[in-house]
């Protein structure tokens, strides 16, 4: 570990109350194939222990979703990835909007430090997929 | 090499016949820039050497496509990635459906074991292009 | 840094000249969350200065966008990473088109060479957005 | 095994439209689509038009504004209607399933042809 | 629309010897890696019979006597050996867009 090899893939636990569009992580091999080595959960947060460059990934897939369904509805659905504490770090890493998609994947590089919050924040009113293999979020240390 | 290294860029040879919705791979510097180094091609599957977490990408796109062509068939086109053998370990790490588009691509990290063997099962009745630049498939050893 | 950790995280910096399908990077922690750590930058394009395998990685967002506006043109915007320079090593290396999609990321291992130049051509007449959570490149390398 | 099996008259009068059934069997229409071609000694083999599984239409530009093509999945048929019809219009029509790849655009299998001669 | 061109109009070949037919389109019907040219076989009172699809790759079925090649505007079917039941008019399809067109055939007569 001193390595600094951190590294965490997380499966979607749940989805916040009204008023919060953050997405709730879960991970450990007892759930499946999702695992934390370094990184920490924090109330469903991912928070980072270690300073380094990360390689930060992500999919979100909709729940039970066509095109069209995408398509029906007024207020576009998008996702962010951001450091959401402390405040004073606190800016959007990575975004997407699903338009007429159901998937939203990508990743990024991004310098992140010891103590950073991240959040993924899902606006819209549609329930992503608890599905192990269609909602994921991980990060990976990659240099100091 | 023993540093664990294992890495493996893949590019589409055929899809299978009829029932076979797995798609067959190749790999190595004399077909352009696909390589295989540590994993290896078992008839057309990637079969993992080295124990520890992969990160796994996979980008397919459909040949001759226009996102009306996609919405002309009537079973949704859908690519699915997972170890399919052995069989006790049988599971799908990263599903995808392309709805409107034309490609889709994404990445996860997953632990894989030593035998395992990835599948990317692609469903649906449209072909996929073979272009090197628009359909490939990798692997790349993160850590134990 | 001699043990080849070369890393790079750029963002927009503007498209090139009508004639010129080319986007324009920078890259710097005065700028936000991007960085050059070993490759470099040559009049906005990215410069490899270490041989080595990589995983690239891009998402590109058009600015103002909606689902209904890219089906709106009739030519198709498509994104395209390739070599660029030494000519002799002109190559594409991954290719997405935006259909009726805003975003395209997506993310592959490639061999690339101390003094390959890699472009990224957009090609279309829509406008990408500069936010740099929405439009970014980048390049890890992960193995000799 | 897979048969499309053509139903329609042989003699058409000028200005009169053409209504021509394809019904097939071994196979579902949900999930292979179906061209419809004709076939005669001035222009050769035509591609007409189109019905993908979803239901949804392609046409050929030249025959646009002349041409329908729909279909009851449940009972397996496929309804081609051409109107205005003019005597060199006489020719074979066929329908041909799309192969299995959907965007291969190559028939594995063909109707038997029906013979049309448009002629007052 | 990609016009097909197919040379010669006609030919006539002994038993056991080999026919070839060109097909030039114009402009290239290749693309996502693959060539979306086809094949298919006529003889008088039946429809059309694939042959070959996507440039080489033989339909179930089909005797490997025939083979096809080719790539991007210019594509070949070779029959060899060729047999008394091969005496038809042979077609070259594209698939590479809508509308999908036809060489005009080629007619194969047995000495």
């Known amino acids: 570990e001193s390595l600094g090899w951190d590294i965490a893939e997380l499966q979607l636990n749940h989805t916040g109350p009204q008023q919060d569009p953050r997405l709730y992580w879960q991970g450990g091999p007892a759930l499946g194939r999702s695992f934390l080595r370094g990184p920490e959960l924090d109330k469903g947060q991912l928070r980072i222990r270690r300073d380094g460059i990360y390689m930060v990934h992500i999919q979100v897939t909709l729940a039970i979703c066509s095109s069209t369904s995408t398509s029906r509805h007024h207020h576009p659905t998008t996702l962010a990835v951001g450091i959401c504490s402390p405040a004073s770090r606190s800016i959007s890493l990575l975004r997407l909007s699903f338009h007429q998609g159901c998937t939203i994947a990508s990743q990024r590089l991004t310098p992140l430090a010891r103590g950073d919050t991240l959040c993924t924040n899902l606006t819209g009113t549609l329930l992503p997929s608890r599905n192990t293999d269609e909602t994921f979020f991980g990060v990976q240390w990659v240099r100091p | 090499e023993s540093l664990g290294w294992d890495i493996a860029e893949l590019q589409l040879n055929h899809t299978g016949p009829q029932q076979d919705p797995r798609l067959y791979w190749q790999g190595g510097p004399a077909l352009g820039r696909s390589f295989l180094r540590g994993p290896e091609l078992d008839k057309g599957q990637l079969r993992i050497r080295r124990d520890g977490i992969y990160m796994v990408h996979i980008q397919v796109t459909l040949a001759i496509c226009s996102s009306t062509s996609t919405s002309r068939h009537h079973h949704p086109t859908t690519l699915a990635v997972g170890i399919c053998s052995p069989a006790s370990r049988s599971i799908s790490l990263l599903r995808l459906s392309f709805h409107q588009g034309c490609t889709i691509a994404s990445q996860r990290l997953t632990p894989l074991a030593r035998g395992d063997t990835l599948c990317t099962n692609l469903t649906g009745t449209l072909l996929p292009s073979r272009n090197t630049d628009e359909t490939f498939f990798g692997v790349q050893w993160v850590r134990p | 840094e001699s043990l080849g950790w070369d890393i790079a995280e750029l963002q927009l910096n503007h498209t090139g000249p009508q004639q010129d399908p080319r986007l324009y990077w920078q890259g710097g922690p005065a700028l936000g969350r991007s960085f050059l750590r070993g490759p470099e930058l040559d009049k906005g394009q990215l410069r490899i200065r270490r041989d080595g395998i990589y995983m690239v990685h891009i998402q590109v967002t058009l600015a103002i966008c909606s689902s209904t506006s890219t089906s709106r043109h009739h030519h198709p915007t498509t994104l395209a990473v390739g070599i660029c320079s030494p000519a002799s090593r002109s190559i594409s290396l991954l290719r997405l088109s935006f259909h009726q999609g805003c975003t395209i990321a997506s993310q592959r291992l490639t061999p690339l060479a101390r003094g390959d130049t890699l472009c990224t051509n957009l090609t279309g007449t829509l406008l990408p957005s500069r936010n740099t959570d929405e439009t970014f490149f980048g390049v890890q390398w992960v193995r000799p | 095994q897979v048969q499309l099996q053509q139903s329609g008259p042989g003699l058409v009068q000028p200005s009169q439209s053409l209504s021509i059934t394809c019904t097939v069997s071994?196979?579902?229409?949900?999930?292979?689509?179906v061209h419809w071609f004709r076939q005669s000694p001035g222009q050769g083999l035509e591609w007409l038009g189109v019905i993908w599984s979803t239901g949804i239409t392609d046409f050929n530009a030249a025959f646009i504004s002349r041409l329908n093509i729909n279909k009851d999945s449940s009972k397996s048929q496929i309804f081609f209607k051409m109107i205005s019809l003019q005597p060199n219009d006489t020719a074979i029509y066929y329908c041909g399933r799309n192969s299995y790849y959907g965007n291969l655009y190559a028939m594995d299998y063909w109707g038997q042809g029906t013979s049309v001669t448009v002629s007052s | 629309d990609i016009v097909l061109t197919q040379s010669p109009t006609s030919l006539a070949v002994s038993l056991g010897q080999r026919a070839t037919i060109s097909c030039r389109a114009s402009k290239s019907v290749s693309a996502s890696g693959y060539n979306f040219m086809h094949w298919y076989q006529q003889k008088p009172g039946q429809p059309p019979k694939l042959l070959i699809y996507?440039?080489?790759n033989l339909e179930s079925g089909v005797p490997a006597r025939f083979s096809g090649s080719g790539s991007e505007t210019d594509f070949t079917l070779n029959i060899h050996p060729v047999e008394e039941g091969d005496a038809a008019t042979y077609y070259c399809q594209h698939s590479r867009e809508l509308p999908l067109t036809f060489g005009a055939g080629t007619k194969l007569e047995l000495k």
């Open positions: 996507l440039a080489s």
């Open positions: 071994g196979f579902s229409l949900t999930t292979y689509a």
